[in-house]
Each structure stands twice: as structure tokens, then as C-alpha cells.
């Protein structure tokens, strides 16, 4: 709960953001989870805590592990975990999955190409943008701000995208790279309030006690490629994680389709032998973008066996 | 545009309870604390105390400890704030306010007039 | 507790030109992390309180840039530089520093 995963480069710059947020928050407290010792303030350290962020300046392999942040604040202390990973330099061109981030969509009218967690960082442009390792030359590509903008992109811009940039800490200087992959949509679009197609709003569905069941959260966000949209379940108003049932899982990533044009998201939430008390539970399906929340709520019903007679 | 909707007001008699909601809407209910207010016009603006949705957690004046219980429900994005063993002391608006990350009381609902009389 | 305090009233002011609002903590809102933990909030007649200063010196989303505030750990002000009519109501001072959390007794804005 309240952990999120980090990676890195060895001999790179690595900042993490702690995974809870105050609200507000008025210090933040970074411990090493396995010995419990607390990280330095002092930026003297190769690795040292600033506010909301831990920094590796630069990451080592050994520093791989679980980091414990305590936001703190005058009403209430929370806790997060930070999963770090530091990796070996790869040395082929080969960015081996692990090491990628999400992939990003563009089209004709909007191929911008963000680098993954820059805002994190102290740097200067420009930004130094290389595809499937090769740096990327010619008057298309403009490195702009912390993304890259292609000009009349095509199918063959798909690929794999490292950005890199120097951040800069009292005046040392620590190179950083990301990778994200790049599809290539051929559509223009438009994005609007999030439309859920499925469920619908406070349905009832029948179920079977000890069967499999599955519901599927579907929403449409506009047309075209969807830079911030999200469909997911909760259970009571918790998240799928955080509720503890093994039984019941969210299909793991989001499906997209393009239903008349449109941009949709699928999420199935998958039930596993279902019980009495799943029925007691309220599923909401929630669907966000940058214009809002939408959500509708589903509730299970016992549905009775069918008995086949010969 | 985030928004606090409040319960209406409320007449109830000395000793008795109520329970005063607060439903937010247009922002993820988890991401805020929801605090409550209370105004008159001898004591001013007073501090009640918080509510974290996200977990439950909860921060009390000391001075309205045993008088208000605060609870949230997740599902409906509803904040609740029970008053019990009500006395005169009691009539006021009551505020409920929702944080940011830079600030406690950075959303208000409407306010419910409470009034407790015989 | 944090007593923060306020006078009932202002200056009469004329709309046009600036007003002061004074605000006394009984201890030093200033943290360790740096941040002077003052807020400025506005009831006008009939409604809610309302944001208007946060961390003693920046502006809220949505409030005009006539208000501003400047203090020192423990003495505080704010200034409206062009009295507008809709300014009108009372100016509440809080502190956020540690629990309870406690606000100003009010100073009310007259215009003239």
C-alpha cells in the first residue's frame, strides 16, 4: 500500500518522489527500510533527502532496496514506500523492458513525446532525444521545453525513445536517461467529460455463488489519442489494491479500442469464486481525464443455478 | 470547480444527537482532508477537527473531544460529523472545509445552521 | 493553544484607495522547514469564508492581485491596494502552524 516502483542507471542521477502526499505536507522524513536508519539531509551525501525527494547523486547497484518516507504534517503522519531498483548500463542499444516507461500515443496533429520524470530534476535545455539509440537529426525533430515534438509524423516514427538531459546539483553535474516507446495514431482528436458505456449507473448484475464472475468498466474519452485518461474499479470507495481480497483483481492494464472513432478504455475486475459477502459490496466504475470524474455503481445479485433435468 | 455540499439546517433538543454530511464533488474525495468549523458570534471560528478519507485517521480539538465524532464514507464521498449530548452551546453554522497540498482550509461548503432548543 | 489576534474593525476606507488589516500571533508561525504557516480568509455578509492568502504570502487561485500580505514570524498584514465594493465583509487571520488550528477574531473592512 502507498508504494511505488523507481529505476535507475548506475553511475546516473536518480530522484524519487515519496508516494504519499500531504495535504499538506510540512516535512517529509526518508528512512532505509531494511536497517531503519535515517537518510542524511546533508547534500554532502551521494545520496540524501530533500523535502518530498530522496536523491542518488549518482545511483549505485547496492542502493537498490526500500525506502521509507513519513510525510508529516500537524494533523496526521503518512506513510509511503519507495521500490528502488538501480541497474547495471546495458552495453548493446538493447533497453531491456524493465527500463521503460509507459508508452505514449501521437498522430499527425499532436506528436508530443514527453521525457518520463524530468520534472523531478534540475536541467537546461535542450533535452538531447535519441531513437532506438541513434540521435535524432533533422529539422522534424524539435526538442521543445521537456518533450519532443515530431513534425508530420508517420508510421515508421513509431519506436523506442531515450531522452537525456544533465541534472544539476550545487554545481556537479549528473547525466540522466529515459525510455519510452512511441506508437503512432492516424487520427485527429478532441477529448470530452468521460462517457461510461458499461456499467450502467447503479445496475444490478447477477452472479452465481462459487463461480467465476467478471465486469467490465468501459468509458470513452473523445477522439483520437488520449494523453490522460484512466478507467479503474473500486470496491466501498477503496482502491482494487489497497481493499486486500486476492480473489478480486483488475485486469492489468488498460485495453484500448476505437469504438465509431471514439477513444475507450476497458477494466475488467475479475471475482473468483464469488461469495455472500461479495454481494454486500459496492463496485464502482471510475473514468477520468483531465476534464472530470464520472462514476457509476454496480451491485451484485445471487442468480440461481438453473437446474437441467434429463 | 471543487465543490463541499452541506446538509440543511437542523433544530434539535438539548441532549440530543445529530449528524451534520458534507458531500464533495468534482475532485477525488482521498486527495483532500476534510475539516470541520464551527462559527458563533461569541466565540468566532473554531476548529473542530479533521478527517483523513483515505484511511479513516482523525484529529480532534481537544475541546470538542466526546462532542464530535468524524467519520467519511469513501463510496459516497461524504464526510460526516456527529454531535452528541447537544446543549445551547451547540447552536452555530458549521463549516466543512477541504485541503490542497499548500493549504488546510482551501475549499468551505455552504455551512448548516444548527440550533438546539427546547 | 495559538491565540491570534485581531481588531473588530478597520479604518474607514474610501473605494479606490488601499487598506490595512492587522493580525498579531501570540508565538512565531515561522517552521523549521521555512514557511510562515499564516492565512488570510474573507467572509462576505451571508456566505462562506473564503481563501484569500496562503503560507503568508501567497495568493489563492482566483483572488485578485489588488491583495497581498507580508508579515514578520509573529505580526502580520494585509493590504488591499484598490478597495473595491465587493471587498466588503469581514478579514479573518489563521494560523496552521500546529493543532488546534486557530483563527483571528475578524476585523471587518468599512468603506466610507
Known amino acids: 500500500k502507498f508504494s511505488k516502483q523507481s529505476w535507475g542507471l548506475e553511475n546516473e542521477a536518480l530522484i524519487v518522489r515519496c508516494p504519499r502526499q500531504g495535504k499538506p505536507s510540512y516535512t517529509v522524513d526518508w528512512y532505509y527500510s531494511q536497517t531503519n536508519k535515517s537518510i542524511p539531509t546533508q547534500e554532502r551525501n551521494r545520496v540524501f533527502a530533500s523535502g518530498q525527494l530522496l536523491k542518488f547523486l549518482p545511483a549505485a547497484v547496492a542502493d537498490s532496496g526500500i525506502y521509507t518516507c513519513i510525510v508529516r504534517s500537524p494533523t496526521f503522519n503518512r506513510t509511503g514506500y519507495a521500490n528502488v531498483t538501480i541497474y547495471k548500463k546495458q552495453s548493446d542499444c538493447n533497453v531491456p523492458d524493465y527500463l521503460m516507461y509507459s508508452t505514449v500515443s501521437g498522430s499527425e496533429k499532436n506528436s508530443k513525446i514527453y521525457c518520463p520524470t524530468i520534472d523531478l530534476y534540475n536541467w537546461t535545455a535542450p533535452l538531447e532525444w535519441f531513437k532506438n539509440c541513434q540521435a535524432l537529426q533533422g529539422s522534424r525533430y524539435r526538442a521543445h521545453k521537456s518533450f519532443l515534438v515530431i513534425d508530420n509524423v508517420m508510421t515508421e516514427d513509431a519506436g523506442d525513445y531515450t531522452c537525456k538531459f544533465i541534472h544539476n546539483e550545487n554545481g556537479a553535474n549528473y547525466s540522466v536517461t529515459a525510455t519510452r516507446s512511441f506508437t503512432v495514431k492516424d487520427e485527429q482528436g478532441f477529448s470530452l467529460f468521460p462517457v461510461i458505456g458499461a456499467p450502467a449507473q447503479n445496475e444490478i448484475k447477477e452472479v452465481e455463488i462459487g463461480k467465476n464472475a467478471n465486469l467490465t468498466c468501459s468509458a470513452c474519452f473523445g477522439k483520437g489519442t488520449q494523453f490522460l485518461a484512466a478507467v479503474l474499479w473500486q470496491l466501498n470507495g477503496t482502491k482494487i489494491t489497497d481493499f486486500g481480497e486476492p480473489r478480486i483483481q483488475q485486469e492489468e492494464g488498460q485495453n484500448q479500442s476505437f469504438s465509431n472513432g471514439l477513444a475507450c478504455l476497458d477494466m475488467v475486475l475479475r471475482i473468483a469464486d464469488v461469495k455472500e459477502e461479495d454481494l454486500l459490496l459496492q463496485y464502482d466504475c471510475l473514468a477520468l481525464n483531465l476534464h472530470g470524474l464520472r462514476r457509476h455503481t454496480v451491485r451484485l445479485s445471487r442468480k440461481n443455478p438453473i437446474d437441467h433435468h434429463s | 470547480q471543487v465543490q463541499l455540499q452541506q446538509s440543511g439546517a437542523e433544530l434539535v433538543r438539548p441532549g440530543a444527537s445529530v449528524t451534520l454530511s458534507c458531500k464533495a464533488s468534482?475532485?477525488?474525495?482521498?486527495?483532500?482532508?476534510i475539516h470541520w468549523v464551527k462559527q458563533t458570534l461569541v466565540h468566532g471560528l473554531e476548529w473542530i477537527g479533521a478527517i483523513d478519507p483515505e484511511t479513516g485517521d482523525t484529529a480532534y480539538n481537544q475541546k470538542f473531544k466526546g462532542k464530535a465524532t468524524l467519520t467519511a464514507d469513501k463510496s459516497s464521498s461524504t464526510a460526516y460529523m456527529e454531535l452528541s449530548s447537544l446543549t445551547s452551546e451547540g447552536s452555530a453554522v458549521y463549516y466543512c472545509s477541504g485541503s490542497t497540498t499548500d493549504c488546510y482550509f482551501a475549499y468551505w461548503g455552504q455551512g448548516t445552521t444548527l440550533t438546539v432548543s427546547s | 493553544d495559538i491565540v491570534m489576534t485581531q481588531a473588530a474593525f478597520s479604518n474607514p476606507v474610501t473605494l479606490g484607495t488601499s487598506a490595512s488589516i492587522s493580525c498579531r500571533s501570540s508565538k512565531s508561525l515561522l517552521h523549521s522547514n521555512g514557511i510562515i504557516y499564516l492565512y488570510w480568509y474573507l467572509q462576505k455578509p451571508g456566505q462562506s469564508p473564503q481563501l484569500l492568502i496562503y503560507?503568508?504570502?501567497n495568493l489563492a487561485s482566483g483572488v485578485p492581485d489588488r491583495f497581498s500580505s507580508s508579515g514578520s514570524g509573529t505580526d502580520f498584514t494585509l493590504r488591499i491596494s484598490r478597495v473595491e465594493a465587493e471587498d466588503v465583509g469581514v478579514y479573518y487571520c489563521?494560523?496552521?502552524?500546529?493543532?488546534?488550528?486557530?483563527f483571528g477574531s475578524g476585523t471587518k473592512l468599512e468603506i466610507k
Open positions: 489563521a494560523q496552521n502552524l500546529e493543532l488546534p488550528f486557530t
Open positions: 468534482d475532485y477525488i474525495f482521498t486527495d483532500s482532508e
Open positions: 503560507q503568508m504570502s
